[in-house]
């Protein structure tokens, strides 16, 4: 027999069926030109000493073979003795070490068996009623196809599925969508209505994330506020990576879960922009303000569940950085200025009302004054910090106020509003005899003492009504009692107490008269 022809003789080997799992498989035969045909197959197992024979039985019942040696591909013409217009049954017999292994057979009409291409190029993936929809352009001149898919997860082997017949310029397939695991899909096509014809190769992997992106399991820590008024947010625990099927472990697009950080600055609500979204890799610096931080996971199907944390405000206060002068026209604050053209946000809130929204004011960009200070003024009519109570004041600064991550804390302090001089006056001043020449003076704490860092000291004044001599005694802001010594019996005294702040002298309390009784000896 000539090598170019199918040989109508008994094959040159004895048949001893090996029954082994290895051997020839995946035989496919198709037309490659107007008169040319090709069959190819895979061989599984050791290839040394293996001879392959392509077997063919015609519709007439006559059978022949092509000897291909070690090759697993054969090209032949329509003159090779194989009928190309009628149905033929083909299979491969591989002979080695006196054993024969047979491939599954294919039955087809060679002339009609065109080599179909798998879906090529961009396969669009979308979600439709809880299922996966894949769509692609039909390869040129190949309208009319049967389509199959196979899919696997990281822990399962391939499962085969059917997309049904396709007869249009675009083809599509509905496939199962997994809720919580990634999947790898591949598609293949063959000519519609020719069951025996060969399938195309499998397409490139289509990597599909789970319907639900994984819950982001991350932990944050916030560093101390630095001298620049900023603190770094750091990621202590990275989100767990999604387990991927084998074909999706390289840089396969489509299966990625992206994590984004959504930052919401709760302090200073009057600023232009309160929320910013940035990639998780780009951990920001924050001011000392309070923030809500959310980590949002999303994949090609959209956002998934998020995890939210509250980052409390940094409560570290600087008692001396802020100067407040109260005049007849109103109040002005002074503080060490930042760079040129800085916008400041001044926020205040009554102490004890931290749950409610703070009041704030945004200054126009300002440069430092000649003394290097920045200022903010308000009139009495505005009512700002007008009530006689303790306010927590925070000042934030930014050269780019619309960029949420560029704000920094300038200072955080307390201020007693309204007429602090009068409101801070100590009440319930009482005098008790202490010894023959001394008394103990007590008073109720000043309202100013509720305001951390505001009360600088108490001053107790004692006046001798006979001589009009006055003595003043400074008392620590934490004390509400003092002992006055070296007093004379029988002399009338008046005592008064006032509470001073760093920038304001308090008003004296009502004078309290007392005297030490003269001791009459027996």
């Amino acid at each position: 027999c000539r090598t170019s022809e199918c040989c109508f003789q008994d094959p040159p080997y004895s048949d001893a069926d090996s029954g082994s799992a290895s051997g020839p498989r995946d035989l496919s035969c198709y037309r490659i030109s107007s008169a040319g045909y090709e069959c190819s197959w895979q061989y599984e197992g050791p290839t040394a000493g293996v001879s392959h024979f392509l077997r063919c039985c015609l519709s007439s019942g006559r059978c022949c073979y092509f000897a291909t040696g070690s090759a697993t591909r054969l090209q032949f013409s329509d003159q090779a003795g194989v009928s190309v217009l009628h149905t033929v049954t083909l299979w491969v017999e591989s002979w080695a070490r006196n054993r024969t292994e047979k491939s599954p057979e294919v039955t087809l009409q060679l002339y009609k068996s065109v080599k179909y291409k798998p879906p090529l190029g961009d396969i669009k993936v979308s979600k439709l009623a809880g299922q996966l929809r894949m769509e692609w352009e039909t390869p040129d001149n190949q309208v009319g196809a049967e389509v199959q898919f196979r899919h696997r997860t990281p822990s399962s082997s391939w499962k085969l599925g059917d997309c049904g017949p396709q007869d249009d310029d675009t083809e599509s397939c509905l496939c199962p969508l997994e809720m919580n695991v990634a999947q790898e899909f591949q598609l293949r096509r063959r000519r519609l209505g020719s069951q025996g014809s060969s399938w195309s190769k499998w397409s490139s992997p289509v990597c599909v994330p789970p319907e639900n992106p994984p819950q982001p399991q991350v932990r944050f820590s916030v560093e101390q506020l630095g001298r620049d008024g900023r603190r770094r947010l750091t990621l202590k625990e990275q989100p767990t990576q999604l387990e991927l099927p084998e074909g999706c472990q390289g840089p396969a697009p489509g299966v990625e879960v992206t994590y984004q950080l959504q930052l919401h600055m709760l302090s200073c609500p009057c600023k232009a922009k309160a929320t910013r979204t940035l990639p998780l890799e780009k951990m920001p610096y924050l001011s000392g303000a309070a923030y809500n931080v959310a980590v949002i996971s999303s994949n090609r199907f959209g956002p998934g569940p998020n995890q939210t944390w509250h980052i409390p405000a940094d409560t570290h206060t600087e008692p001396v950085a802020l100067n407040i002068s109260v005049g007849t026209n109103g109040t002005t604050m002074y503080w060490p200025a930042r760079a040129q053209s800085t916008t400041y946000c001044i926020e205040w809130q009554p102490v004890g009302q931290e749950g409610s929204l703070a009041t704030c004011n945004l200054t126009a960009p300002q440069d430092p004054d000649p003394a290097g200070m920045a200022t903010y003024s308000w009139s009495r009519e505005s009512g700002a910090m007008g009530q006689e109570k303790c306010y927590h004041i925070t000042i934030f600064a930014s050269a780019h106020p619309k960029k949420l991550t560029l704000w920094s804390t300038v200072l955080s302090t307390y201020h007693f509003g309204g007429n602090a001089s009068a409101a801070g006056t100590p009440h319930h001043v009482s005098v008790k005899n202490h010894s023959l020449d001394s008394v103990s003076v007590d008073w109720a704490p000043s309202l100013l003492s509720t305001c951390p860092g505001v009360l600088k000291e108490y001053v107790v004044r004692c006046r001798d009504e006979d001589s009009n001599q006055v003595s003043e005694h400074p008392v620590q802001p934490t004390e509400t009692q003092v002992t006055l010594s070296d007093l004379r019996a029988g002399v009338a005294y008046t005592v008064q107490v006032r509470a001073d702040t760093a920038w304001l002298r308090g008003a004296w309390s009502q004078p309290q008269r007392f005297s030490i009784k003269v001791q009459v000896s027996d």
């Epitope: 006559r62 059978c63 599954p104 057979e105």
Partner: nanobody
Framework: QVQLVESGGGLVQAGGSLRLSCLAS???????MGWFRQAPGKEREFVAA????????WYADSVKGRFAISRDNAKNTVNLQMNSLKREDTAVYYC??????????????????WGQGTQVTVSS
């Protein structure tokens, strides 16, 4: 060693139908299978054959369109559905297994294993 047992033969009127079945004792999914028949005083002749997967089928011209061969590899059976039976279909029908598939599917000598046969009689 494969053993084949035919069943389903019998007496039937012309124009009627019969279904022959062949049960194999061994694994025959790797063999081409065929049905042959032998009328009294005549040589054994080819009726139909089927490839290993069932994708390829072959028939003698005299039975084309009337007989249908099928197989169920899971059950190790091969069936021959015979419709529109004629008097000349009367014969002993044999099931055969071709382990090797040589030069044709219809040559008696190609087949390695044979059953004992089942009688089909078509009366007028």
């Amino acid at each position: 060693q494969v053993q084949l047992v035919e069943s389903g033969g019998g007496l039937v009127q012309a124009g009627g139908s019969l279904r022959l079945s062949c049960l194999a004792s061994g694994r025959t999914s790797n063999y081409f299978m065929g049905w042959f028949r032998q009328a009294p005083g005549k040589e054994r002749e080819f009726v139909a054959a089927i490839s290993r997967s069932g994708g390829g089928t072959w028939y003698a011209d005299s039975v084309k369109g009337r007989f249908a061969i099928s197989r169920d590899n899971a059950k190790n059976t091969v069936n021959l559905q015979m419709n529109s039976l004629k008097r000349e279909d009367t014969a002993v029908y044999y099931c055969a297994a071709d382990r090797r598939t040589g030069t044709s599917v219809y040559t008696v000598d190609e087949y390695d294993y044979w059953g004992q046969g089942t009688q089909v009689t078509v009366s007028s």
